[in-house]
C-alpha cells in the first residue's frame, strides 16, 4: 500500500513539476524591467526564450518573437534547448510511469517489469528536473551579470545634459515557476525510485517443499536462488538531491492605486 | 462614435475644491484609461494624472500630490476629477483625454474652464 | 522629470511650403524593448482641445493628412508639414510618452507667411 501510495504521489508531483516546466518554458516573462528606482513606470519590457514584449501604462502590449537562430545568444540558446530536453524527458518518463504504476494493470505484467518502468521514469524525472533547475539558473546567471554589467554603464553619454538611461532587467516570474518545477519533478523522480524499490521482488525465501519419500516423512529444504532482477540492495545508498526553490513576489508594474510621479 | 462630454465651467475661492466631471461614450469605457491634462490661460499642456475606470488605480503628477482626487462611475461611465486647496495659479481649462497605444491621447474632451479669484 | 524643448516659439511659413518644428527631450525617450520612441506630436487650434497627430515619433494617428510626418531618435524629433494648408495654422506640442510625469514642451505656433 505504501509502496502505491510513494508511486501515485511520486507520479503527481512529477505530473505537476513537468507542467509547470512546459508553462515556465512558454512564459514570457523570464526577465522583467527592473522597477528599482522607478516603481510606476509608463513603458515595461519583459522577455521571455522566444519573444520579448513591451507593456504601456495604456495597456497595449506589443511582442515580438526572436526571428533569427543565429542572431540570437549562446546562452539563451542553451537555456532553451536545457528546457526542451526536460520536457521531453519529463513527457517520455510521464508515458513510461503511467504503464508502470502499481494501480494500473495491464496485461499480465509482472511486477519486475513495472519495477524496471519505474526506475526508469525516475531517473527520467530526476534529469528533467535537473535540466529544468539548470536552464533556469543559467539565465539567472545570465541576468545577474548583464544587471551589474548595466548598472556599471547605468548612464551612457553623459556630455551635457542629455541622459541615456539604460534599462536594466531582473528575475521574472518564469524563473521562480521554473525553479519550482524542476524542483518538483525532481522530488517525483526521487519518489518514483524509492517506489521502485519497493516494486522489485524481494530475496524470496520459498516456503519448504514437502517430499514424501516411501517409508519416510523427511521434508527436503533446497537451497533458495536470488531471483535476478536487475535491482540489487545497493539502491539503499541512492543520494537525493533536492533543488531548493525561490519564490518572491513579482513586482507589479502598473500603476497601483494613488501613485505619484 | 468616441465622445467625452464635460461639465460647465466654474468659478471658486482660493482654497476652495472643484470637482469636473468627463462622461465617456462610445466605446469600453472601463478598458481605458483617462487622463487628465489642463491649460492655464496662454500657456501650455501640462499633465495632472490618470485613472483606470475598470479597477479605479491612479497615477498622478507629483506637482499635485495631496491635492488631486481622480474617481471614475462605471454605472455612468463617467470620471471624475478634484482638485483641492485652489490657488489663483489653478485659473485654467481642464481636459479629460482617453489614454490609447503608444501612450498618446487620441480623444478629447471639450475642456472646462475653472476660474480661481477671490 | 524629462524637459521637452521646442523650437522655434513661433514660425511663420507660405502657404505650400515646408513647415519644421523641432522638440528636444532632456532624457532618450527610446525603448530598447521595442526600439521605438515614446514621443508625441498634438496640434491646437484656437478654443479647441489638443487633437492627436503622431504617436511612437513617426505613427500618423488614422485620419491625419499625409503631409504631416514626424521624425527623430533618442533625444531629437522633427515634425514636417510637407506642404502647409491654411487649417494647418495651429499651436503644436510635443510630448514625453516614456517616462511619467508626463510633460510637454512649450508650444510652437504656426502662422502663414
Known amino acids: 500500500m505504501a509502496v502505491t501510495a510513494c508511486q501515485g504521489l511520486g507520479f503527481v508531483v512529477s505530473l505537476i513539476g513537468i507542467a509547470g516546466i512546459i508553462a515556465a518554458t512558454c512564459m514570457d516573462q523570464w526577465s522583467t524591467q527592473d522597477l528599482y528606482n522607478n516603481p510606476v513606470t509608463a513603458v515595461f519590457n519583459y522577455q521571455g526564450l522566444w519573444r520579448s514584449c513591451v507593456r504601456e501604462s495604456s495597456g497595449f502590449t506589443e511582442c515580438r518573437g526572436y526571428f533569427t537562430l543565429l542572431g540570437l545568444p549562446a546562452m539563451l540558446q542553451a537555456v532553451r534547448a536545457l528546457m526542451i530536453v526536460g520536457i521531453v524527458l519529463g513527457a517520455i518518463g510521464l508515458l513510461v510511469s503511467i504503464f508502470a504504476l502499481k494501480c494500473i494493470r495491464i496485461g499480465s505484467m509482472e511486477d519486475s517489469a513495472k519495477a524496471n518502468m519505474t526506475l526508469t521514469s525516475g531517473i527520467m524525472f530526476i534529469v528533467s528536473g535537473l535540466c529544468a533547475i539548470a536552464g533556469v539558473s543559467v539565465f539567472a546567471n545570465m541576468l545577474v551579470t548583464n544587471f551589474w554589467m548595466s548598472t556599471a554603464n547605468m548612464y551612457t553619454g553623459m556630455g551635457g545634459m542629455v541622459q541615456t538611461v539604460q534599462t536594466r532587467y531582473t528575475f521574472g516570474a518564469a524563473l521562480f515557476v521554473g525553479w519550482v518545477a524542476g524542483g518538483l519533478t525532481l522530488i517525483g523522480g526521487v519518489m518514483m525510485c524509492i517506489a521502485c524499490r519497493g516494486l522489485a521482488p524481494e530475496e524470496t525465501n520459498y516456503k519448504a517443499v514437502s517430499y514424501h519419500a516411501s517409508g519416510h516423512s523427511v521434508a527436503y529444504k533446497p537451497g533458495g536462488f536470488k531471483a535476478s532482477t536487475g535491482f540489487g540492495s545497493n539502491t539503499k545508498n541512492k543520494k537525493i538531491y533536492d533543488g531548493g526553490a525561490r519564490t518572491e513576489d513579482e513586482v507589479q508594474s502598473y500603476p497601483s492605486k494613488h501613485d505619484y510621479v | 462614435q468616441v465622445q467625452l462630454v464635460q461639465s460647465g465651467a466654474e468659478v471658486k475661492k482660493p482654497g476652495a475644491s472643484v470637482k469636473v466631471s468627463c462622461k465617456a461614450s462610445g466605446y469600453a469605457f472601463s478598458s481605458y484609461w483617462m487622463n487628465w491634462v489642463r491649460q492655464a490661460p496662454g500657456q501650455g499642456l501640462e499633465w495632472i494624472g490618470q485613472i483606470y475606470p475598470g479597477n479605479g488605480d491612479t497615477t498622478y503628477n507629483g506637482k499635485f500630490k495631496g491635492r488631486v482626487t481622480m474617481t471614475a462611475d462605471k454605472s455612468t461611465s463617467t470620471v471624475y476629477m478634484e482638485l483641492s486647496s485652489l490657488r489663483s495659479e489653478d485659473t485654467a481649462v481642464y481636459f479629460c483625454?482617453?489614454?490609447?497605444?503608444?501612450?498618446?491621447?487620441?480623444?478629447w474632451g471639450q475642456g472646462t474652464l475653472v476660474t480661481v479669484s477671490s | 522629470d524629462i524637459v521637452m524643448t521646442q523650437s522655434p516659439d513661433s514660425l511663420a511659413v507660405s502657404l505650400g511650403e515646408r513647415a519644421t518644428i523641432s522638440c528636444k527631450s532632456s532624457q532618450s525617450l527610446l525603448n530598447s524593448g521595442n526600439q521605438k520612441n515614446y514621443l508625441t506630436w498634438y496640434q491646437q487650434k484656437p478654443g479647441q482641445p489638443p487633437k492627436l497627430l503622431i504617436y511612437w515619433a513617426s505613427t500618423r494617428e488614422s485620419g491625419v493628412p499625409d503631409r504631416f510626418s514626424g521624425s527623430g531618435s533618442g533625444t531629437d524629433f522633427t515634425l514636417t508639414i510637407s506642404s502647409l494648408q491654411a487649417e494647418d495654422v495651429a499651436v503644436y506640442y510635443c510630448q514625453n510618452a516614456y517616462s511619467y510625469p508626463f510633460t510637454f514642451g512649450q508650444g510652437t505656433k504656426l502662422e502663414i507667411k
Open positions: 483625454a482617453r489614454f490609447v497605444k503608444g501612450n498618446a491621447m487620441d480623444y
